[in-house]
């Protein structure tokens, strides 16, 4: 019967007694940077070309005995998970292996860099179809390794890496912390984060998604027909590399940004028990388990968005945090969040010719996060319209005044330390969907976009008194592009998007002694692209 | 994911203007930085990746590596160029004493230097 991990990543329509999704990734080459591998194992024979690349450190210890099967164990298993005949994800994918880890599973940053350079040179000498690079390894944060990954990604290569097995913030490790790399955490058959001895899967904002990574059956280097069960974020990353190979084989022109958005979109949502993660990491860690798309084609019509959290700003008075989208994504909205509630909002601003999302800490605050909503919007022309603080009782408002521009997000930023001490009523304008409204002492920023067929609407959900959390979701066929809170007073900790739901967090009324007039409203901006839908229908 | 350093340790080694008239001073106002792994047991001192500024050509990388070797030799230090990078990042991998870091950071075209460190199968 089908192993649990293959069943987990398979949409119901493909489930039979066998795992045989439509295209096995035959147009894609997957590079594996790992240990040596037993390339003639029955599960992978003919699928893996062992390159002559080898850059590994000496094994530790004077009495180390090099046993071939042990040297090959990690890499052979991963090659099997990616493309194995019977237990692999992308059965049609061809692989190339580079040896950067020694018989003890240890390598160096420099050896990995030289390996990545080897791949780039191979790509230049003999351009083939789409390339996926699997990096089932981790070291401490490395500026140079992250930079090399960035360069390779910008050359059109999809890099997939293990989040790390240290039960720690993945941002402290490389290449897991490289923004251009798809970073994968591990979950088990119960959709729980994987525990590995006293440690376990890494987590946090640098993880893109999770995938099966416990008790994964794959090729064993003990014999040519043997299988073994292994666990770790390497196994999880191998699943995503296989899924990526299949997606790219079906749609070879997909960019890295498009692939990442699809991986997120087709993942199983909200199935991971977040209680396993440290409390301060729960909001930052994506609750996503990778899965194959239900159909290999026809996803192009959707407006894809994802949420990108910044690093923590730190506690100083003027501290700021910046969240950035990938080069070919559009920043459609910007929000902020602070656990202490002390923040001075957020704003969208240009940096190096691209919009970024900047959040501002407040005096006495423990720090803030900036949260960017990053979307794929072809032929988009977006700009930010700002209204300075109105100082009048009606509050500050700003709208999209250019012809054909629609509102995709609202941000507000204030200089006063505590808006909560200034409590004028905020009047809600009705029938003006292209308008952002905020506190009279805040400057308001509207993200206004023009794109073929783009239409957006505002959805609100308010509750009379703060109860920790208010949510509002976009309905089927619409994508959440903007998420903000009204009125933005001191008991609002911030707003952020989780998949297609806008979440506004506030301090519990019982702890703040607030009055019921301070209603908290979650405001979602939901968009869709008629143009993308039409283009997709024409293709079909 | 963000490209900020987090807990990553960064040491900016000051340039002493009187030292090494031989070295071309880096462009005004840019100080090359030195980075090393925050996790001490994973550090591999003695091997360094010297990363050069983005548009540096291979020939300049090779010249910079040779210059480092020459200046190190003048001070009685042996160095070994293990690899010259080009294609992804301009730079070179060098085996040398940590005593030479200050000298290396003053070389022309140097953006930053990172001490090598271990990576592990996950």
């Amino acid at each position: 019967s089908i192993p649990w991990n293959l069943e987990r990543i398979t949409p119901p329509r493909y489930r039979a007694d066998e795992y045989q999704p439509p295209d096995g990734g035959s147009l894609v080459e997957v590079y594996l940077l790992d240990t040596s591998i037993q390339s003639d194992h029955r599960e992978i024979e003919g699928r893996v070309m062992v390159t002559d690349f080898e850059n590994v450190p000496e094994e530790d210890g004077t009495r180390f005995h090099r046993q071939a099967s042990k040297c090959d164990s990690h890499g052979t298993h991963l090659a099997g998970v990616v493309s194995g005949r019977d237990a692999g994800v992308a059965k049609g994918a061809s692989m190339r292996s580079l040896r950067v880890l020694n018989c003890q599973g240890k390598g160096t940053v420099s050896g990995t860099l030289i390996g990545l350079e080897f791949i780039r040179k191979s790509q230049l000498v003999q351009p083939v179809g789409p390339l996926v690079v699997l990096l089932p390894l981790a070291g401490g944060y490395s500026r140079v390794l992250n930079a090399a990954c960035q360069r390779l990604a910008r050359a059109g290569v999809v890099l997939v890496t293990a989040a790390g097995n240290f039960r720690d913030d993945a941002c402290l490790y490389s290449p897991a912390s490289a923004p251009e790399v798809i970073t994968v955490g591990a979950t088990n058959a119960q959709d729980q984060p994987v525990t590995l001895g006293t440690l376990g899967t890494n987590f946090g904002r640098c993880v893109d998604l999770f995938a099966p990574g416990e008790d994964i059956i794959g090729a064993s280097s003990d014999c040519s027909t043997c299988f073994v069960s292994q666990s770790g974020t390497s196994q999880a990353a191998a699943h995503v590399a296989g899924i990526a190979a299949m997606m790219l084989s079906a749609e070879p022109e997909l960019t890295l940004a498009e692939l990442r958005q699809r991986l997120i979109h087709f993942s199983a949502k909200d199935v991971i028990n977040e209680a396993w993660f440290p409390e301060d990491q729960r909001v930052l860690t994506p609750n996503l388990v990778a899965a194959l798309p239900p159909s290999t084609h026809g996803a192009g019509w959707q407006l894809f968005c994802r949420t990108v959290w910044s690093a923590h700003s730190g506690p100083t008075r003027m501290a700021t945090a910046i969240a950035r989208c990938a080069p070919d994504e559009e920043l459609l909205s910007c929000s902020s969040f602070s656990r202490s509630g002390k923040r001075r909002g957020e704003r969208m601003e240009a940096q190096g010719g691209k919009l970024v999302c900047r959040a501002h800490n407040a005096f006495g605050g423990e720090g803030v996060y900036a949260i960017a909503r990053c979307c794929l919007l072809p032929q988009a022309n977006c700009s930010v319209h700002t209204a300075p603080p109105a100082e009048a009782s009606m509050g500050t408002r700003v709208h999209c005044h250019q012809q054909g521009h629609v509102l995709t997000g609202c941000s507000s930023h204030w200089e006063v330390e505590d808006l909560g001490t200034h409590k004028p009523p905020v009047l809600r304008p009705r029938g003006q969907p292209n308008q952002c409204v905020g506190h009279r002492e805040a400057s308001i920023h509207a993200s206004c976009c023009h794109a073929p067929g783009l239409e957006c609407k505002v959805k609100e959900h308010g509750i009379p008194a703060p109860q920790g959390q208010v949510t509002v979701a976009c309905e089927e066929g619409w994508t959440l592009t903007g998420c903000s809170a009204l009125p933005g007073t001191s008991h609002v900790l911030g707003a952020y998007a989780v998949d297609n739901t806008c979440v506004v967090r506030s301090r519990d009324v019982s702890t703040t002694g607030s009055t019921s007039e301070e209603a908290v409203t979650a405001v979602a901006i939901c968009c869709r692209s008629r143009h993308l839908a039409q283009a997709s229908q024409e293709l079909q | 994911q963000e490209d900020e350093d987090g807990d990553y340790e960064e040491l900016v080694l000051a340039l002493r203007s009187e030292e090494d008239g031989l070295a071309e001073a880096p462009e005004h106002g840019t100080t090359a930085t030195f980075h090393r792994c925050a996790k001490d047991p994973w550090r591999l001192p003695g091997t360094y990746v010297v990363v050069l500024k983005e548009e540096t050509h291979l020939s300049q990388s090779e010249r910079t590596a040779r210059r480092l070797q020459a200046q190190a030799a003048r001070r009685g230090y042996l160095t070994k160029i293990l690899h010259v990078f080009h294609g992804l990042l301009p730079g070179f991998l060098v085996k040398m004493s940590g005593d030479l870091l200050e000298l290396a950071l003053k070389l022309p075209h140097v953006d930053y230097i990172e001490e090598d460190s271990s990576v592990f199968a996950q």
Epitope: Q38, S39, D40, E45, G46, A68 | -
Partner: antibody, heavy 115, light 109 residues
Framework: QIQLVQSGAEVKKPGASVKVSCKAS????????ISWVRQAPGQGLEWMGW????????NYAQKVQGSVTMTTDTSTSTVYMELRSLRSDDTAVYYC????????WGQGTTVTVSS | QSALTQPASVSGSPGQSITISCTGT?????????VSWYQQYPGKPPKLKIY???NRPSGVSNRFSGSKSGNTASLTISGLQAEDEADYFC?????????FGGGTKLTVL
């Protein structure tokens, strides 16, 4: 092109041994092992075993375990199959084939065991 | 006694379609995605026609197709031609080895 070239026909007496060779070319040798298959006159195919060109590991069919030895010489890209204590029912055409997938076959070597 | 069971012979007229079955157990055919089909002419080595249940090697006519249901695999040849007359063998992985079927003689009438 991809080729497996086998040694010539052999006639052996019962109790003797035979060693058949198979030279591989045209593909990355370590990506595949070599399977050995035999076919008695007018009969079906019987898988005898497999040898790794990567590390020399072997996997023999239970029926021939103890009487067969497969070896490899990486310097000449040649694999050998030795069958000991031959009996008349070992008379067959012996084929080498690429890997477990057996997608490429040698031309066959006829081994006749007769007193 | 072969591990996989095939009909001893099948026949068909030119242009017709024929199907050859190959029945095993859950430990071989039913348990793996690696059923292959070989064509063999007298005095020649076998030639791979189908691998991994339903894949055709390059150069093999699309008249040849393979499928599997449970513990039985099938080879279908459509638009039968005179040159298809040959012996056909199936093979499958087992946990540690390989097994063949006894072979089916295809006669084109």
């Amino acid at each position: 092109q991809i080729q497996l070239v086998q040694s010539g026909a052999e006639v052996k007496k019962p109790g003797a041994s035979v060693k058949v060779s198979c030279k591989a070319s045209g593909y990355p040798l370590t990506s595949y092992g070599i399977s050995w298959v035999r076919q008695a006159p007018g009969q079906g195919l019987e898988w005898m075993g497999w040898i790794s060109a990567y590390n020399g590991n072997t996997n023999y069919a239970q029926k021939v375990q103890g009487s067969v030895t497969m070896t490899t010489d990486t310097s000449t890209s040649t694999v050998y199959m030795e069958l000991r204590s031959l009996r008349s029912d070992d008379t067959a055409v012996y084929y080498c084939a690429r890997g477990y997938g057996m997608d490429v076959w040698g031309q066959g070597t006829t081994v006749t065991v007769s007193s | 006694q072969s591990a996989l069971t095939q009909p001893a012979s099948v026949s068909g007229s030119p242009g017709q379609s024929i199907t050859i079955s190959c029945t095993g157990t859950s430990s071989d055919v039913g348990g793996y995605n690696s059923v292959s089909w070989y064509q063999q002419y007298p005095g020649k080595p076998p030639k791979l026609k189908i691998y991994e249940v339903s894949n055709r090697p390059s150069g093999v006519s699309n008249r040849f197709s393979g499928s599997k249901s449970g513990n039985t695999a099938s080879l279908t040849i459509s638009g039968l031609q005179a040159e298809d007359e040959a012996d056909y063998f199936c093979s499958s992985y087992t946990s540690t080895s390989m097994v063949f079927g006894g072979g089916t003689k295809l006669t084109v009438l």
